[in-house]
């Protein structure tokens, strides 16, 4: 008997979708109604839970009790400031556990709690069933997408979702990544290409830019904003349509809840028309006090409402251009993703910003997520058909990581937008003589000082043998795998100690809103952040080159190669610049720069002298590019150069 | 002895550039730090900057940054001052002074008139 | 940056008597390691290049006469002129160095 499939699901915030990899191909599965998405719907009654189609249908008559959105709940706080937001938008009730949201509804007759990920394992459970009546056998192992910012709490959230649905997950990827593999498997042997995938959706919208060779998938860049998608465009219209009923009845729809929903479920179907058509008419019957409501609206009307929303998605285009250092016209294709993306506006807009450029709409946008999930569930199967067979995917680290250095300064060993797998290894030393230990703090983030980033963990590599500052050498590694693990490790390379922190999804990381919030605090930020970093540079760098300067005088082994006078010059100098150093650590870059030159001005025609034909450093040897490096609580490491 | 002989006085219109020389003797070049201070008519010292003389690396006051560059010859002992896009008021007389723990030998002094 | 407000701008002085004038830092000069004040005196006479006169708050530059001496710390300095000759007449600059270099004002001293 043939092995059983892996399917992928994209798990949508307002629709999901299925597909599995067999007999050398992908296929999209359609459910019950025979619809290739299924809403992300659950619904509670007083004699059963409905999920999807029939879940979404019936939220008209029954929304206190139809829960939707789940995704936006998923793996955050109750106090999270999104949640907080989203919950005045939302029919159902959610109720705060232990900083924990819970949906509250009424089943059965009884009041029940279910946490986010309770919901979205209804939605799983759902998309599992599909897959299994297809395929006529059970299916357990699935791969399982999430929006490219999903922070590591959410990730796992999901993971768990698809623990509670009975699934085995074999991997959560990011929707963007997902959709070029659906895209790259058409295209394998056509060279390197540039491709920007657009994924606007129900509720998130995703700005990839990925390198396609040959099969290989790199993801350069990734941006976006988890709160855009068609259901805000929804609200636009139905806002637009809550104003007309106003005008013409002289009566506020707004605070009846059933008359919205209504009123939104027309106003989606309209949106939809008006991708094909130029106007939608709308024809609710006794929409509010017995009125009916019969209405018409343009798509120039349409675009007009959300005329801000469009233009706001070429922001996510232009910065995920600038973090891939490619200019517009770098990019070989267009991808369009997600149901929205078929707004004619939409489309217009991307397609102006790069000068008429074709789009590629080859991928129903509203599949190709699930299809990718599909193509890597296969991977991970071991599936040796020859579509797939050579096909690697390479996702990115959103934020750089790296380790607190002296002076408090960010020093990243894995960069942001770094493909993973990827492990890179940098040789720190000691800030202090006789430093027993060090202390390796590890952060995540874009900014300059590690203060103003995100701690992630920290540990301590103790037993350092006595030695002079900058003698030690420790070798720190960080090691990221496919799951986005971190794994770092500190090697003292004289006694061969180790010692390592794993950093895993359930340590709390930051959100997608932090995450953004941090990149652009860190484009904000990035001169002043860029005059901080040269300035504990130049001060580590004079710091570095005094100590350097004082020992290698002080050296036994010069003892008769230099004079007591220069020795007592660089001596004297060196206490001067020391000295100084303490009394101001806070100076300009400019003053540390000085303060260097002249201490190099007095050391290296002495130092030079005593090197000149012994094949050891010339002048300068020593090095005036010190440190890079930092304060904190514990022992300092320093970066070596 | 210790000397700093510095280039002729130079007249220049608005624009153009001027570069005043400063020859060393006397001492090793390269072990002293050389600075170029300003003198306005009838104004006080102003300091320019330095530079390192054995890395060759410049250091400019606030006021210099940009139109100013300092830079040596060791070969013969010679730092450089070169202004460029000048303007009327930068005539002053230019001076170069060895550094030891302080500016310990001056130049003469080179004066720039800058007049169109 | 550090500021040196020299005082007075000028004074005259009878051949003979003591010429006292101050330099005022807007940040201390001392380095606690060495010690030391980082400023220096300078002495120029019209239409001649400036001389160094005293260095590290009160040390003379050899060849300089006794009868000058510097005193203060911190950011208060002196120089005195103890018995005003002739050949002393001249503006006189007081210059930090303790983070890049700054010249004071300069005072014009003159025979009554």
């Known amino acids: 008997m043939a092995k059983a499939a892996a399917i992928g699901i994209d798990l949508g915030t307002t629709y999901s979708c299925v597909g599995v990899f067999q007999h050398g191909k992908v296929e999209i599965i359609a459910n019950d109604q025979g619809n290739r998405t299924t809403p992300s719907y659950v619904a509670f009654t007083d004699t059963e839970r409905l999920i999807g189609d029939a879940a979404k249908n019936q939220v008209a008559l029954n929304p206190q009790n139809t829960v939707f959105d789940a995704k936006r709940l998923i793996g955050r706080k109750f106090g999270d400031p999104v949640v907080q937001s989203d919950m005045k938008h939302w029919p159902f009730q959610v109720i705060n556990d232990g900083d924990k949201p819970k949906v509250q509804v009424s089943y059965k007759g009884e009041t029940k709690a279910f946490y986010p990920e309770e919901i979205s394992s209804m939605v799983l459970t759902k998309m599992k069933e599909i897959a299994e009546a297809y395929l006529g056998y059970p299916v357990t192992n699935a791969v399982i997408t999430v929006p490219a910012y999903f922070n590591d709490s959410q990730r796992q959230a999901t993971k768990d979702a698809g623990v509670i649905a009975g699934l085995n997950v074999l991997r959560i990827i990011n929707e963007p990544t997902a959709a070029a593999i659906a895209y790259g498997l058409d295209r394998t042997g056509k060279g390197e290409r540039n491709v920007l995938i657009f994924d606007l959706g129900g509720g998130t919208f995703d700005v990839s830019i990925l390198t396609i060779d040959d099969g290989i998938f790199e993801v350069k860049a990734t941006a976006g904003d988890t709160h855009l998608g068609g259901e805000d465009f929804d609200n636009r219209l139905v806002n637009h349509f809550v104003e007309e009923f106003k005008r013409k009845h002289k009566k506020d729809i707004s605070q009846n809840k059933r008359a919205v929903r209504r009123l939104r479920t027309a106003c989606e179907r309209a949106k939809r028309t008006l991708s094909s058509s130029t106007q939608a008419s709308l024809e609710i019957d006794s929409l509010f006090e017995g009125i009916d409501f019969y209405t018409s609206i343009t798509r120039a009307r349409f675009e007009e409402l959300c005329s801000d929303l469009f233009r706001s998605t070429l922001e996510p285009v232009e910065k995920a251009l600038r973090d891939a250092k490619l200019d517009k016209a770098q990019i070989h294709d267009l991808v369009l993703v997600g149901g929205s993306t078929r707004i004619p506006k939409v489309q217009k807009l991307l397609q102006d910003f790069f000068n008429g450029r074709d789009l590629n709409k080859s991928i129903n946008p509203d599949e190709a997520v699930a299809y990718g999930a599909a193509v890597q569930a296969a991977i991970l199967m071991g599936d040796k058909s020859e579509n797939v067979q050579d096909l690697l995917l390479l996702d990115v680290a959103p934020l750089s990581l790296g380790l607190e250095t002296a002076g408090g300064v960010m020093t990243a060993l894995i960069k942001r937008n770094s493909t993973i797998p990827t492990k890179q290894t940098q040789i720190f030393t000691t800030y202090s003589d006789n430093q027993p230990g060090v202390l390796i703090q590890v952060y995540e983030g874009e900014r300059a000082m590690t203060k103003d980033n995100n701690l992630l963990g920290r540990f301590e590599l103790s037993g350092i043998p006595p030695a002079p500052r900058g003698v030690p050498q420790i070798e720190v590694t960080f090691d990221i795998d496919a799951n986005g693990i971190l794994n770092v490790t500190a090697t003292d390379k004289s006694t061969g100690k180790a010692n390592k922190i794993t950093i895993t999804n359930d340590k709390g990381r930051l959100s997608k809103e932090e995450i953004e919030r941090m990149v652009q605090e860190a484009e904000k930020y990035k001169a002043e952040d860029e005059v901080q970093r040269e300035r504990v540079s130049a001060k580590n760098a004079l710091e570095s080159y005094a100590f350097n300067m004082k020992s290698a005088v002080e050296d036994e082994g010069l003892k008769g190669k230099i004079s007591e006078a220069d020795k007592k010059k660089v001596l004297d100098k060196c206490q001067e610049v020391i000295s100084w150093l303490d009394a101001n650590t806070l100076a300009e870059k400019d003053e540390f720069e000085h303060k260097r030159k002249e201490l190099e001005q007095v050391c290296n025609p002495i130092i030079s002298g005593l090197y000149q034909g012994a094949g050891g450093p010339g002048p300068g040897g020593f090095g005036a590019q010190g440190p890079k490096g930092g304060s904190g609580s514990g022992p300092t490491i320093e970066e070596v150069d | 002895q210790i000397q700093l002989v510095q280039s002729g006085a130079e007249v220049k219109k608005p624009g153009a550039s001027v570069k005043v020389s400063c020859k060393a003797s006397?001492?090793?070049?390269?072990?002293?730090?050389m600075n170029w201070v300003r003198q306005a008519p009838g104004q006080g010292l102003e300091w320019m900057g330095w530079?390192?003389?054995?890395?060759?690396?410049?250091t400019y006051a606030d006021d210099f940054k940009g139109r100013f560059t300092f830079t040596t010859d060791t070969s013969t002992s010679t730092a450089y001052m070169e202004v460029r896009s000048l303007r009327s008021d930068d005539t002053a007389v230019y001076f170069c002074a060895r550094y030891d723990h302080a500016m310990d030998y001056w130049g003469q002094g080179t004066l720039v008139t800058v007049s169109s | 940056e550090i500021v040196l407000t020299q005082s007075p701008d000028s004074l005259a002085v009878s051949l003979g008597e003591r010429a006292t004038i101050n330099c005022k830092s807007s940040?201390?000069?001392?380095?606690?390691?060495?010690?030391?004040?980082?400023l220096a005196w300078y002495q120029q006479k019209a239409g001649q290049s400036p001389k160094l006169i005293i260095y590290w708050t009160s040390t003379r530059e050899s060849g300089v006469p006794d009868r000058f001496s510097g005193s203060g710390s911190g950011t208060d300095f002196t120089l005195t002129i103890d018995s005003l000759q002739a050949e002393d007449v001249a503006v006189y600059y007081c210059k930090q160095s303790y983070t890049l270099y700054t010249f004071g004002g300069g005072t014009k001293v003159e025979i009554k």
């Open positions: 530079i390192n003389t054995y890395t060759g690396e410049p």
């Open positions: 940040q201390s000069l001392l380095n606690s390691g060495t010690r030391k004040n980082y």
């Open positions: 006397g001492y090793t070049f390269t072990n002293y730090g």
